[in-house]
C-alpha cells in the first residue's frame, strides 16, 4: 500500500537534484582555482543534511550551517553586486565584467540557482511531486531558508560601494517583501558598506523618466540612510547598450549616460 | 488607428470634484502612458500627470500632485483623472493624450471642458 | 520645471511662402540616454493638439514634408518651406526631456 505522502502546493524536486549540485560542484571547483579544495561529495552530503528527512515546514538557518561552512568562500568585497527581479541582466553583466559578484556566481549561489528541493518528515526520500509554496504553504521552507540564509552572508561581507539592479518595469522597483528588501537591505554593515549604488533597468520600451525618483526608490533611500549608509541612484535607459559599453567601453557611443 | 474618446463636458461649483475619464481603443493601451493635458480658455497647454496603465506607475506634475488623482482601468481600456477642490482658474479643456514613441504625445482625445462657476 | 520660450508670438504669411518659428528651453533637452525630446504640436481653430515633429526632426506619420525642424541643446526651429491655408492654427513647442513635460507659450500662424 503506497504510503499517503502530503501534496505541497509549490513544484517538487527539480529532477535529478542530487546529480545537478554534484555536477554543478565538480564544474564550479573546477573552473575557480580558488575553490578546487572542496570536497565536493562532502557538499552534496552537507546539502542532503540540511533538508532530508525533516519537515519541509520547519527548516533553520542551523539545518544549513554545515553546507556554509563548506561553501566559505572569499569575494572581493567591494565588488558584489545584488539584485531583484532582474537576474537574468545582472548574471548577463557578471560575466562580461569578471571582477564582479553575483551570489549566483559564488559556489553556494551556483549550486542551488534556479532549483527547487524539499524532502519528507522521518524518511530519507526526496519529494520530486511537490514542496511547500512560500505563500500558500509555509515561509521555513527548504528553499526559501537556503537562499534567507546565503542572501544574508552576501551581504554581512559585502563592503565599501554596493551595487544593486533592480527592475524598472515592475510596479514596485524596490519590493520590501523581495529577498534584496527583506534580508540583503538589513544586512549591510555600516562599519563597511559606505554607499549603495541602485541601477534602475529600464523595459524594452523607450522612456526619458527618470525612475530614480519613484516612491519605491525613495523609500530605499530612506531605509538605507537610516542605517548609516549613503544612497545614489542611477538610470539605465537602455540595457543592451548598457552592456555592449561593458564589454566595448571604448566604443565613441560609449561616453555619455546609457 | 488610436482612438481616444473623452466624457462630456461638465460644469462644477468650486470645492466640488470632477472626474474626466478618457477610453482608449488601443490594445497597446496598457503598456503605453497616458497623460493629461489641461488648456485654459485662450491659454496654453500645461501637462498634469501620467499613467502607465500595467504596473500603475504615476507621475504628477508637481503643481497639480496635491489634487489630482489619475487612475486606470485595464479591463475597459480607460483612463481617468479625477481633479479635487475645484476653483475657477480650473476651468480649462482637459485633454488625455497617449505615447506614440516613449514620452511622445502621439495621439489626443477630443477634449472634456470644465467649467468651474459658482 | 523647465521653460520654453517661443518667438514670435504671431505670424500672418502669405501662402506659398515660407514660414520659421523659434523655441528655446531654460536648460538643454540632450537627455542621458542620447535622445533630444523636443516636439512640435499644431492646434488647429476647434481642435485638439496634434502631433508635428518629434524628437527635433522627426515627422510624425501624415505630416506632410514641408514641414521640418531643427536644433539641439537649447534652441529649436520648426519651418515650413511653403505655407499652406490648412496650416493655420497655433504651433506649440514642447519638451518630454525633464519631467514635468512643458509647453511653449505657442505661435499662432495666420493666413495673409
Known amino acids: 500500500v503506497p504510503r499517503w505522502r502530503q501534496q505541497w502546493s509549490g513544484p517538487g524536486t527539480t529532477k535529478r537534484f542530487p546529480e545537478t549540485v554534484l555536477a554543478r560542484c565538480v564544474k564550479y571547483t573546477e573552473i575557480h582555482p580558488e575553490m578546487r579544495h572542496v570536497d565536493c561529495q562532502s557538499v552534496w552530503d552537507a546539502f542532503k543534511g540540511a533538508f532530508i528527512s525533516k519537515h519541509p515546514c520547519n527548516i533553520t538557518e542551523e539545518d544549513y550551517q554545515p553546507l556554509m561552512k563548506l561553501g566559505t568562500q572569499t569575494v572581493p568585497c567591494n565588488k558584489i553586486l545584488l539584485w531583484s527581479r532582474i537576474k537574468d541582466l545582472a548574471h548577463q553583466f557578471t560575466q562580461v565584467q569578471r571582477d564582479m559578484f553575483t551570489l549566483e556566481d559564488t559556489l553556494l549561489g551556483y549550486l542551488a540557482d534556479d532549483l527547487t528541493w524539499c524532502g519528507e518528515f522521518n524518511t530519507s526520500k526526496i519529494n520530486y511531486q511537490s514542496c511547500p509554496d512560500w505563500r500558500k504553504d509555509c515561509s521555513n521552507n527548504p528553499v526559501s531558508v537556503f537562499w534567507k540564509t546565503v542572501s544574508r552572508r552576501f551581504a554581512e561581507a559585502a563592503c565599501d560601494v554596493v551595487h544593486v539592479m533592480l527592475n524598472g518595469s515592475r510596479s514596485k522597483i524596490f519590493d520590501k517583501n523581495s529577498t534584496f528588501g527583506s534580508v540583503e537591505v538589513h544586512n549591510l554593515q555600516p562599519e563597511k558598506v559606505q554607499t549603495l549604488e541602485a541601477w534602475v533597468i529600464h523595459g524594452g520600451r523607450e522612456d526619458s523618466r527618470d525612475l530614480c525618483q519613484d516612491p519605491t526608490i525613495k523609500e530605499l533611500e530612506s531605509i538605507i540612510s537610516k542605517r548609516n549608509i549613503q544612497f545614489s541612484c542611477k538610470n539605465i535607459y537602455r540595457p543592451d547598450k548598457f552592456l555592449q559599453c561593458v564589454k566595448n567601453p571604448e566604443d565613441s557611443s560609449c561616453t555619455s549616460e546609457i | 488607428q488610436v482612438q481616444l474618446v473623452q466624457s462630456g463636458a461638465e460644469v462644477k461649483k468650486p470645492g466640488s470634484s470632477v472626474k474626466v475619464s478618457c477610453k482608449a481603443s488601443s490594445e497597446v493601451f496598457p503598456t503605453s502612458y497616458m497623460s493629461w493635458v489641461r488648456q485654459a480658455p485662450g491659454q496654453g497647454l500645461e501637462w498634469m500627470g501620467d499613467?502607465?496603465?500595467?504596473?500603475?506607475?504615476?507621475f504628477y506634475g508637481e503643481k497639480f500632485e496635491d489634487r489630482v488623482t489619475i487612475t486606470a482601468d485595464k479591463s475597459t481600456s480607460t483612463a481617468y483623472m479625477e481633479l479635487s477642490s475645484l476653483r475657477s482658474e480650473d476651468t480649462a479643456v482637459y485633454y488625455c493624450?497617449?505615447?506614440?514613441?516613449?514620452?511622445?504625445?502621439?495621439?489626443w482625445g477630443q477634449g472634456t471642458l470644465v467649467a468651474v462657476s459658482a | 520645471d523647465i521653460v520654453m520660450t517661443q518667438t514670435p508670438l504671431s505670424l500672418s504669411v502669405t501662402p506659398g511662402q515660407p514660414a520659421s518659428i523659434s523655441c528655446r528651453s531654460s536648460?538643454?533637452?540632450?537627455?542621458?540616454?542620447?535622445?533630444?525630446?523636443l516636439h512640435w504640436y499644431l492646434q488647429k481653430p476647434g481642435q485638439s493638439p496634434q502631433l508635428l515633429i518629434y524628437?527635433?526632426?522627426n515627422r510624425f506619420s501624415g505630416v506632410p514634408d514641408r514641414f521640418s525642424g531643427s536644433g539641439s541643446g537649447t534652441d529649436f526651429t520648426l519651418k515650413i518651406s511653403r505655407v499652406e491655408a490648412e496650416d493655420v492654427g497655433v504651433y506649440y513647442c514642447s519638451q518630454s526631456s525633464h519631467l514635468p513635460w512643458t509647453f511653449g507659450g505657442g505661435t499662432k500662424l495666420e493666413i495673409k
Open positions: 536648460q538643454s533637452l540632450l537627455h542621458s540616454n542620447g535622445n533630444t525630446y
Open positions: 499613467i502607465l496603465p500595467n504596473i500603475g506607475r504615476i
Open positions: 493624450a497617449r505615447e506614440a514613441y516613449g514620452s511622445i504625445l502621439g495621439y
Open positions: 524628437k527635433v526632426s
